[in-house]
Structure formats: C-alpha cells, structure tokens
C-alpha cells in the first residue's frame, strides 16, 4: 500500500465574518487506522478544532459522513466565523493507539476572515477656536480584516491633505483598528461647514463608510461691537444702541455700564441665525441726560461664550444737550473695543467698523 | 478510552423477544457504525447487523433481517439490539462491536450478554 | 455471500515455533487495492481482540510476532515465535460486501 499521505488542496481561504468556511482534507489510504484531528496553528501551543473520535464542536461539523465506507475525505465545515477563526488550519492523521499516536499532518491552509470596519467615528477638539487657527479631527474605525485600508478626509467636499493615519497593529493580528488625525484650518465662515472621514476597505464592495463632525462644534465666532447714539427721543433721553454682529455660538451676555457702574445685564436667547450660521443682537440703553451734570461713560460689555470680556465704550456729553434738540452728532463715540483676547486673530477685527 | 458497557445475562422463554443494550462512551456515538455479533456455546462468530448511529442507517445479515431490530438513542450514546420470536438456538453469547475505521470490522468490543433461551 | 474458510481447525505448535493459520474466499476480497480481510483473537471468556487489519496491518497494541499476508482470495495469519499467551481462537473475517467471519482455527500448544 502506498503511504499516507493527508491534502489539504487549499494554501488559503478568505471567508466574510458571518460566513461559514470549508476547509477541505483528504487522505490517500486507509492505512493506517485512526482518527483525524483539525488544529489551528502547529507546535505545542496549537489549538483543537475538530476531532473526529470525540469532543463536541458546536460550530464544526464534517463535510462528508464520517461513518461512510472507507471514508477518506476529512473536510470540515465551520459556521459563523469570526475575525477569531483567522489562522492556519492544519488536519492531522492519527493512528489509532492508547493514546493515538500522530502519523501525519497536511501542508495546514490559510484561514482569512473579511471583516467590515465599524462606522467611522470622527472626533473634534475639546474646546472651541477661532477663526485662522487650526484645529485637529480624529476618526477611528475598528475591526476591520484585512489590512489594507484607504482613509480619505474631506471638507464640505473637498479633499483635505493635512492628516495622518496610523493601522494597528503593525504585525499581523485577527482585525485591525485605523485612527487618522486631520489638521483643519477654520475660517469665520465655517460653522455650517462639515468634515467627514471616508474609510474604503475590500468587504464594502466600493461603498465607503463615512463618519462625519460638524465644524460648529469646533468653532468659536467672536462677535464685533459697535457703540451707536440714535436721534433723541423725548425731553433729556438718549438712545444708545450696542450692535453685537456675527458672532458664534449663541452663549452671549451684553452688560450696560454707566460710568463703571452696571446698569443693566442681558443673555441672547432664541436669536434668528444669518445665512453663514452666525448670530447678531442689538441692545440699546436709554440714558436720562438730565439726571447728569457730567458727561456720562456707556460702555457696552460682551462675554462671548466664556471667554473674557469685550468692551466698546461711548461718551454721551450731557453740555451738548439742549433741552430743546437732538442730534446725533452731538455725542462723540470715543470708544475702541477694548478686548484682551490673547488670540491674534482678533486684533483684525478692529478694522470692521 | 472507547468503552462498550452491555446490559446484563438473560433467560427467555421461546417465542419471547430480548433487547440488548450497549452503552457507548470514550468517543463521539454518532461517528462511528456500531456492529452485532454473536457466538453459540462452544461455536464461531456469527456477525447480525450494523447501525450508523448519525443517521440510524442499517444493514443486516439475510438470516436475521425479519427478527432483529437495531435501534440508537444518540442522547444517552446506547446501541440497542432487540431479536423477536427466540428459539432454543438462539441461545449465545451477543457482542455489540464498534468499527473505528470505518472498514466494516470491529475494533472495540463489549464484554458481551448471555441470552438464554429455554423453556 | 462471501464464504470465509480457514485451515487448519486447530493446530498445535511448540513454543517458540511459528504458527499459520489460513483463510480462503469464495471470491475475491479485493478492491481499491485494499484486501479487506482482518483477523482476531479470542481467549477463553473474552470477547474477541482485533490482530490484523486490511490483510497487512498490525492493529494498536499488537505484538510484532503477529502479521498478516495475502490478496485476492488466500490470506495466511503467521505468528513468527508461538509464546504461551497465544493460545486462542483465530477467527478471519472480510468486510468485500457485508461481513461474514471464518469458522475459526484453534491454537494450542504441542
């Protein structure tokens, strides 16, 4: 009789977790007798699979009956494979003894699971900034087999080069994770603008997943100030009105100071957005000339979504004031906004009025 | 190791039935075909019939085929014989063997049952 | 059906001394180049013990004094060196189409 030897015709099988797999062995003689044992991996440390004699493996069955006549055909089918299942599957023939004794082993095939990455996950900085600055997105993606992965980042639809993408691990394991950090500049016109992270892999038949961040998240929009005196009203009342425009988000609070003293503190609320996703607001003070002999300091003061106050003062000159006119002119806007934002960016905003 | 544990001795009445029991153990029941031999006092071995017990598939020896019956009951891993309408000849030793290569041979026996049949 | 006839019934052999038992079909065991014919051993209120396997094959466990040759029709079960423990019946059986077993040789010693 010729020599036993064990096939196993498969190097490799890719099989999509969910899937089942069959991997196929059959031995050339019937000699000697004994039971054949699956193995994931080889040496010492290998793992039992399938044995033909005894266990119970649940998500193992044989292909062919085993009962069957001079049944030499040892294949086996595992259901619901997992990234877990990966590995080298090796059958091994036994001769039958107390305990069995190994005879041979096939060549071992290549088991490799297709797994789908996760939804991207895409995350922004943990404070907000302004405009110019550049600030960092994250996207994460897990589970994925096999390796190669493409990531691709995008800015209201336009391709973005700035980032950089890491796959772990490095060596081969059952799944993998990708975690990619972009770099973006914001732009005052960026609070309806969108990231989006686009993962493209070999199980998602070219329909990539995508993770998306609303750069509103990201952004801070601070506002620009401007102090104004409107006509006079009736007898001794000036108007004066602070116009808070296009700032973002909404968290804003505007303080009325007469001559350093807090005359009135208001909270922007339900406030309608412009088209470019920012806010404006206008608060106005009526200031009763008559009850001042000097010239009264307003000064109109913002804190803008926690960050440090700014001012814009305005001196109403109580000696212009005839009882009988008003003018607009005859009150001198001596204010500057007196911001101590450390943000550079901030300083061009002066230049707006 | 593989074990094949009979039921014990028993004495029938001609005409009578009797159920032999095997109860399998040391490796998977239902991969291996469970064979029925039988030996007279002082005679050879007569083998009676085999039973897959995956799929309860049986082939039986001509002379036997109208009295034996080969049953398996998978959860317990027990191989059951039961011959019909005994005669005084009948009268043997009975084995339950199992074929570990699937060659139709018997590797593995029981200590066997001794049916007696008299009147 | 496959008749299985051995020779001699019984046979007697000094210690030490080979012994052969012979078995012969009524019609060929052979196929897929395998002879399916195995031989047993059985001992006085034993069951029986599997020797040989497919004509050639020691089973587990088998001394190597034991062997088994033959094609086609005519097998020989040959013990090289007889030791006392050996004595038993030897029964052949083929598995070609479904089993039978020889009328069984036994072994003594003289």
């Known amino acids: 009789e010729e020599e036993l030897q064990v096939i196993q015709p498969e190097k490799s099988v890719s099989v999509a977790a969910g899937d089942s797999a069959t991997l196929n062995c059959t031995v050339t003689s019937l000699i000697p007798v004994g039971p054949i044992q699956w193995f994931r991996g080889a040496g010492p440390g290998r793992e039992l699979i399938y044995h033909q004699k005894e266990g119970h493996f649940p998500r193992v069955t044989s292909v062919s009956e085993s009962t069957k006549r001079n049944n030499m055909d040892f294949s086996i089918h595992i259901s619901n494979i997992t990234p877990a299942d990966a590995g080298t599957y090796y059958c091994v023939k036994f001769r039958k003894g107390s305990p069995d004794v190994e005879v041979k082993s096939g060549a071992g095939t290549e088991l490799s699971v297709r797994a789908k990455p996760s939804a991207p996950v895409v995350s922004g900085p943990a404070v907000r900034a302004t405009a110019e600055h550049t600030v960092s997105f994250t996207c994460e993606s897990h589970g994925f087999s096999p390796r190669d992965i493409t990531l691709k980042w995008f800015k209201n639809g336009n391709e973005l080069s700035d980032f950089q993408t890491n796959v772990d691990p490095a060596g081969k394991s059952v799944s993998y994770s990708i975690r990619s950090t972009a770099r973006v500049v914001l732009t005052r016109r960026d609070v309806h603008s969108q990231v989006i992270c686009e993962v493209a892999h070999v199980t998602l038949q070219g329909d990539p997943l995508r993770g998306t961040a609303n750069l509103s998240e990201a952004i801070r929009v601070p506002p620009f100030l401007e102090v104004t005196q409107q006509s006079m009203r009736a007898d001794n009342q000036v108007n004066v009105t602070c116009q808070v425009t296009k700032f973002y988000p909404q968290r804003l609070q505007l303080t009325w100071l007469e001559n350093g003293n807090v005359s009135r503190t208001e909270m922007a609320s339900a406030l309608p957005e412009n088209k470019d996703g920012t806010y404006n607001w206008t608060s106005w003070l009526l200031v009763n000339v008559s009850a001042h002999r000097d010239d009264v300091k307003l000064t109109c003061q913002v804190e803008h979504d926690g960050q440090p106050a700014v001012n814009k003062s305005f001196s109403v000159k109580v000696s212009a004031h005839p009882k009988e006119q008003g003018s607009n002119t005859a009150a001198e806007n001596t204010g500057t906004n007196e911001r101590d934002y450390k943000d550079d960016d901030d300083k061009h905003h002066h230049h707006h009025h | 190791q593989v074990q094949l544990v009979q039921s014990g001795a028993e004495v029938k009445k001609p005409g009578a039935s009797v159920k032999v029991s095997c109860k399998a153990s040391?490796?998977?029941?239902?991969?291996?075909?469970i064979n029925w031999v039988r030996q007279a006092p002082g005679q050879g071995l007569e083998w009676i019939a085999m039973?897959?017990?995956?799929?309860?598939?049986?082939h039986y020896n001509q002379i036997f085929k109208d009295r034996a019956t080969l049953t398996t009951d998978t959860s317990t891993s027990t191989a059951y014989m039961e011959l019909r309408s005994l005669r005084s000849d009948d009268t043997a030793v009975y084995y339950c063997?199992?074929?570990?290569?699937?060659?139709?041979?018997?590797?593995?026996w029981g200590r066997g049952t001794l049916v007696t049949v008299s009147s | 059906d496959i008749v299985l006839t051995q020779s001699p019934d019984s046979l007697a052999v000094s210690l030490g001394e080979r012994a052969t038992i012979n078995c012969r079909a009524s019609?060929?065991?052979?196929?897929?180049?395998?002879?399916?014919i195995f031989w047993y051993q059985q001992k006085p209120g034993q069951p029986p013990k599997l020797l040989i396997y497919?004509?050639?094959n020691l089973d587990s466990g088998v001394p190597d004094r034991f062997s088994g040759s033959g094609s086609g029709t005519d097998f020989t079960l040959t013990i090289s060196s007889l030791q006392a423990e050996d004595v038993a019946v030897y029964y052949c059986?083929?598995?070609?189409?479904?089993?039978?077993f020889g009328q069984g040789t036994k072994l003594e010693i003289k």
């Open positions: 063997a199992m074929d570990y290569g699937s060659l139709y041979a018997m590797d593995y």
């Open positions: 040391g490796y998977t029941f239902t991969n291996y075909w």
């Open positions: 039973i897959d017990p995956s799929d309860s598939e049986t």
């Open positions: 497919l004509a050639s």
């Open positions: 059986q083929h598995s070609r189409e479904l089993p039978t």
């Open positions: 019609k060929s065991v052979s196929s897929s180049g395998y002879n399916y």
